[in-house]
C-alpha cells in the first residue's frame, strides 16, 4: 500500500492503489548536497549522477571506522525519497549528487559554499531545463551561505532546505534562514510537528512550509534493495524538492517566487497543532503541509498571495522592523503586531526601488513585527497614497484617486505613544470601499495599485464587546491582499493574514474592560484578476 | 612535509611579485565586517572565507588573495589559500592565524569575512 | 556508446567451475550494478543476481546461493560470474545486463557442461 | 516468486498486422512490467520498461499498456525486422522473473 508521507502529499484525485501521478519530473533535475550515496541501489538507479564533486572534512575521532554503508546513508535515503522508483515523489526527476558531507554527516559552510559554486559553473557551461538544489543539511546562522544561495537563487536555480532539527527558531540556522530559499519543517503521519528525541523540527518566520518528516521509508544503504524508515527535516525537504520537481516539469517557465506561491497555495491549511510550538513562534510559523497540486495545469488564473513577517524589531522606542516580499512579488500591504500593544503602526516605504513595509515600536513597547502581503502581479503597477494626520473628528482618510487604481492595503501610523485613549474614534461612513480611514492622530497609507483586470472589494467583521480575536475571510474566487484593523485603538495588538483570513488581535479582555473602547473591526480587502482568469481560459 | 614546502614556496613567490609599498586600507568609508558563527562548538577558527565587494573581478580576488599572502609573510605568518571563488559570490578562502584577521579585513575590496563552521545533515 | 562486453565461450567438465567476465564502458560504472542472467537452449530467461561495482554487494537468486559467486573489479571495469560445481543442466548462455533496469545487455557467453 | 504467464506461446502473422501479447502475473506488480524481443542468437534488448514507456531508439509501431496483474504488448504494424520472440519481465519484486515467451513467426 502507498506510505503514508506520498498519501498526505498527494491529492485525492491521484490515489489510486499506488502512487503514480502524470509526469513525474522529467525534465527537471535535481541537485543533491550530502554525503556519498550508493547510487545503484535498485531504487534509485539511472536516476541519480554521481559528480565528481567532494568537499568534506575529516571526520571526528580516532576510533572512527569508515562503513560506506554507514556513510551513504543519508544521501542515499533521501534520493530515494525525492526520485525514488517505488517510494520516490517524483520518480521521473533525474538527480546529480555532491558530497559536501562526511561518513559522520558532518561538513563545512566553506564546503558547501564550493559545491554551489560547482552547481552554477555547471550550469553555465551546460544549461539544462529547471534545477532544484536540496541542502539537507544546516549549520548556524551564516551571512556568507545566505549569499551564495540568494546568488543561485537570482539566476533562476530553486534551492530547498531543511529548516534543521533543533526545535529551535528556523532563523537561527542557514541555509534555512535565506529567505531566497524555499525552507521546510517536518511533521509526522498526524500532522503534528516531529519531536527527534528530545529535540524536533525548526520552526518561526524563515519556515515556508512543513512536509511529511518522521517515519519516512525510503532507500537504505545496508542493500541494493533494502528500505529503511528515516525522520527528520532532511526528509521533509525532499518531498518539497519532490513537488517542485513536478510543478517544474508541468510548468518548466515557473519563477521562484511563483513555485513558492504555488507551493503555499496547495498545502493543506491549519492542520498542525500549534501548541507544540513557544507560544511566542505560533504566529509567525506557518500552519501549512505541502502537497501536489490537483492539477498539474490551470492554476494560472489565480491571484497568489502570502504573507511574510519581519525579524523582531527589538524594544527599544525608536525600533523598527521591515517586511520585504521577493525581487518578482509586489508589496500590496503592511500590517504590524505587538505583543504589548505597543506600537506606532506602520508605513509602505520605497527601499531601494521596491516597497518594503516598516513597522515602528512605542515608548515602554516590548518590539513590533512589520507583516508584508506579497502578491504575484503581474504588470502590476503600485503607488503609496498618504494622508497626514487630520487633527478632525472624522478621523483621517485617504484613497486612490488615479483612474484604474484599485485599493489593495491600509496601513496607519502614528507619532503619539497612546493613540486612541483621547476620543472615541469613529467607524468610517459606508459605500466608500476605495478609501483608507484611521485615528485622526495617525497618518493613512493606502496601497493602490493598477493591473490588467484587478478588481477588489472591502470586507468587515466587526464586534462591539472586547475580543481577542476578530477574524473575516475572503470568499471563495477572491484572494486577502489587504488586512488591517478599523480604527486602530490602543488596546488592537495589531492584524495579520492567515492564509486566506485577516485576524485582527486585542488585548486580553480582562485587562480592558467593556467599553465602547472594545469595539474592534477587521479589514479585509479582497481582490482578484480577471485578467488572469480569462487568460488561463484562453490557454485552456 | 610536502605540504609545508608547497606553502612556502608560493609565499616566497607571492613575496617577491609583491611592492612593499602597497595601501593596506580599504576603499574610503566602507569597514569590513568579521562574522562567525554563534554557536561555540561548531567553529572552524583558522580557516576563513574572505568575500569580496559585489563586482569584484577573478583577477582582482587572485591579487587580493595574494597580497594577504605576502602581508602575512612580512609578519611571519603562514597562509595558505585553499580556493578562489568566482561564479557565485568573488573571494577566497584562506587557511591563516585569526590574528591576521584586522591586516585582512583592511584589504582593498573586501566586503566582510566569516570564519569557517559547521553543518550538519539533518 | 554504453556496451557491456563479454568473455568467449567455454567448455567444462561437471563438477567444474567457470568464470564468466563482463566489461563495462560508455557510463559512469558506480551508478549501476550488474545483473547475470542465463538461457538454458531453447528455454526462457532466467535472472541469477547483481552485484554492485560502487561497493562489491551482491543479490543472489535463491536457486544459485552457495554455488556462485558474483564479483566486480572497477579499476578493469569488469564484472565477473563464477559457477562452481558445474552440472549438465547448467548448459546454456550466460547474460551480463545492466543494472536491476537490464536496459543493456553482453553479447552473451555461452558455457557448455558436457563429459 | 511472482510467476509471470505468457500468451499466446506462439503466433503467426503477416507483415503489416496488428499484433497483441499478453502477459498475467500471480500478483499485482502496478506498472513494474517490462518487455523484452530476442531474436535468435542475440541477446534481449529491452523495448518497453515500466509498462508503456519506451526506450529511445525503439520505434513507436510498439507499445505497452496495463497495470496490477494483467498487461499487453502491441505492435501496431508488423514489419520483417519484428520476427522474434517476446519476453515480459516483472520488476516489482527480486528475483525478476520472466514469463516464457511468445515467439512470433511469419505467417
Known amino acids: 500500500s502507498i506510505p503514508w508521507n506520498l498519501e498526505r502529499i498527494t491529492p485525492p484525485r491521484y490515489r489510486a492503489d499506488e502512487y503514480q501521478p502524470p509526469d513525474g519530473g522529467s525534465l527537471v533535475e535535481v541537485y543533491l548536497l550530502d554525503t556519498s550515496i550508493q547510487s545503484d541501489h535498485r531504487e534509485i538507479e539511472g536516476r541519480v549522477m554521481v559528480t565528481d564533486f567532494e568537499n568534506v572534512p575529516e571526520e571526528d575521532g580516532t576510533r572512527f571506522h569508515r562503513q560506506a554503508s554507514k556513510c551513504d546513508s543519508h544521501g542515499t535515503h533521501l534520493a530515494g525519497v525525492v526520485s525514488g522508483r517505488d517510494a520516490g515523489v517524483a520518480k521521473g526527476a533525474s538527480m546529480r549528487s555532491l558530497r559536501v558531507l562526511n561518513c559522520q554527516g558532518k561538513g563545512t559552510v566553506s564546503g558547501t559554499l564550493i559545491g554551489l559554486e560547482f552547481i552554477r559553473k555547471s550550469q553555465l557551461v551546460q544549461p539544462v531545463g529547471p534545477l532544484v538544489v536540496l541542502l539537507p543539511l544546516a549549520g548556524g546562522y551564516s551571512r556568507v551561505l545566505n549569499a551564495a544561495c540568494q546568488r543561485l537563487a537570482r539566476a533562476g536555480v530553486v534551492l530547498v532546505t531543511a529548516a534543521g532539527n533543533f526545535r529551535d527558531d528556523a532563523c537561527l540556522y542557514s541555509p534555512a534562514s535565506a529567505p531566497e530559499v524555499i525552507t521546510v519543517g517536518a511533521t509526522n503521519a498526524q500532522d503534528q510537528p516531529v519531536t527527534l528525541g528530545t529535540l524536533g523540527t525548526n520552526f518561526g518566520r524563515c519556515v515556508d512550509l512543513f512536509a511529511p518528516g518522521e517515519d519516512i521509508i525510503g532507500a537504505s544503504s545496508d542493500c541494493s534493495t533494502c528500505f529503511v524508515s528515516q525522520s527528520g527535516t532532511s526528509q521533509a525537504a525532499a518531498h518539497v524538492a519532490g513537488i517542485a520537481a513536478m510543478m517544474l516539469s508541468a510548468e518548466p517557465e515557473l519563477t521562484l517566487a511563483e513555485l513558492r506561491q504555488r507551493l503555499i497555495h496547495f498545502s493543506a491549511k491549519d492542520v498542525i497543532n500549534e501548541a507544540w510550538f513557544p507560544e511566542d513562534q505560533r504566529v509567525l510559523t506557518p500552519n501549512l503541509v505541502a502537497a501536489l497540486p490537483p492539477s498539474t495545469h490551470g492554476a494560472g488564473w489565480q491571484l497568489f498571495c502570502r504573507t511574510v513577517w519581519s525579524a523582531h524589531s527589538g524594544p527599544t522606542r525608536m525600533a523598527t522592523a521591515v517586511a520585504r516580499c521577493a525581487p518578482d512579488e509586489e508589496l500590496l500591504s503592511c500590517s504590524s503586531f505587538s505583543r504589548s500593544g505597543k506600537r506606532r503602526g506602520e508605513r509602505m516605504e520605497a527601499q531601494g526601488g521596491k516597497l518594503v513595509c516598516r513597522a515602528h515600536n512605542a515608548f515602554g513597547g516590548e518590539g513590533v513585527y512589520a507583516i508584508a502581503r506579497c502578491c504575484l502581479l503581474p504588470q502590476a503597477n503600485c503607488s503609496v497614497h498618504t494622508a497626514p494626520p487630520a487633527e478632525a473628528s472624522m478621523g483621517t482618510r485617504v484613497h486612490c484617486h488615479q483612474q484604474g487604481h484599485v485599493l489593495t492595503g491600509c496601513s496607519s501610523h502614528w507619532e503619539v505613544e497612546d493613540l486612541g485613549t483621547h476620543k472615541p474614534p469613529v467607524l468610517r461612513p459606508r459605500g466608500q470601499p476605495n478609501q483608507c480611514v484611521g485615528h485622526r492622530e495617525a497618518s493613512i497609507h493606502a496601497s493602490c495599485c493598477h493591473a490588467p483586470g484587478l478588481e477588489c472589494k472591502v470586507k468587515e467583521h466587526g464586534i462591539p464587546a472586547p475580543q481577542e480575536q476578530v477574524t473575516v475571510a475572503c470568499e471563495e474566487g477572491w484572494t486577502l491582499t489587504g488586512c488591517s484593523a478599523l480604527p486602530g485603538t490602543s488596546h488592537v495588538l495589531g492584524a495579520y493574514a492567515v492564509d486566506n483570513t485577516c485576524v485582527v488581535r486585542s488585548r486580553d479582555v480582562s485587562t480592558t474592560g467593556s467599553t465602547s473602547e472594545g469595539a474592534v473591526t477587521a479589514v479585509a480587502i479582497c481582490c482578484r484578476s480577471r485578467h488572469l482568469a480569462q487568460a488561463s481560459q484562453e490557454l485552456q | 612535509q610536502e605540504d609545508e614546502d608547497g606553502d612556502y614556496e608560493e609565499l616566497v613567490l607571492a613575496l617577491r611579485s609583491e611592492e612593499d609599498g602597497l595601501a593596506e586600507a580599504p576603499e574610503h568609508g566602507t569597514t569590513a565586517t568579521f562574522h562567525r558563527c554563534a554557536k561555540d562548538p561548531w567553529r572552524l577558527p583558522g580557516t576563513y572565507v574572505v568575500v569580496l565587494k559585489e563586482e569584484t573581478h577573478l583577477s582582482q580576488s587572485e591579487r587580493t588573495a595574494r597580497r594577504l599572502q605576502a602581508q602575512a609573510a612580512r609578519r611571519g605568518y603562514l597562509t595558505k589559500i585553499l580556493h578562489v571563488f568566482h561564479g557565485l559570490l568573488p573571494g577566497f578562502l584562506v587557511k591563516m592565524s585569526g590574528d591576521l584577521l584586522e591586516l585582512a579585513l583592511k584589504l582593498p575590496h573586501v566586503d566582510y569575512i566569516e570564519e569557517d563552521s559547521s553543518v550538519f545533515a539533518q | 556508446q554504453v556496451q557491456l562486453v563479454q568473455s568467449g565461450a567455454e567448455v567444462k567438465k561437471p563438477g567444474a567451475s567457470v568464470k564468466v567476465s563482463c566489461k563495462a564502458s560508455g557510463y559512469t560504472l558506480n551508478n549501476y550494478g550488474i545483473s547475470w542472467v542465463r538461457q538454458a537452449p531453447g528455454q526462457g530467461l532466467e535472472w541469477m543476481g547483481w552485484?554492485?561495482?560502487?561497493?562489491?554487494?551482491?543479490n543472489y537468486a535463491q536457486k544459485l546461493q552457495g554455488r556462485g559467486t558474483m564479483t566486480t573489479d572497477p579499476s578493469t571495469s569488469t564484472a565477473y560470474m563464477e559457477l562452481r560445481s558445474l552440472r549438465s543442466d547448467d548448459t546454456a548462455v550466460y547474460y551480463c545486463?545492466?543494472?536491476?533496469?537490464?536496459?543493456?545487455w553482453g553479447q552473451g557467453t555461452t558455457v557448455t557442461v558436457s563429459s | 516468486d511472482i510467476q509471470m504467464t505468457q500468451s499466446p506461446s506462439s503466433l503467426s502473422a503477416s507483415v503489416g498486422d496488428r499484433v497483441t501479447i499478453t502477459c498475467r502475473a500471480s500478483q499485482s506488480i502496478n506498472n513494474w512490467l517490462d518487455w523484452y524481443q530476442q531474436k535468435p542468437g542475440k541477446a534481449p534488448k529491452l523495448l518497453i520498461y515500466a509498462a508503456s514507456t519506451r526506450p529511445s531508439g525503439v520505434p513507436s509501431r510498439f507499445s505497452g499498456s496495463g497495470s496490477g496483474t494483467d498487461f499487453t504488448l502491441t505492435i501496431s504494424s508488423l514489419q520483417p525486422e519484428d520476427f522474434a520472440t517476446y519476453y515480459c519481465q516483472q520488476d516489482q519484486d527480486i528475483p525478476p522473473t520472466f514469463g516464457q515467451g511468445t515467439k512470433v513467426e511469419i505467417k
Open positions: 545486463a545492466r543494472g536491476y533496469v537490464m536496459d543493456i
Open positions: 552485484v554492485s561495482f560502487y561497493n562489491g554487494n551482491t
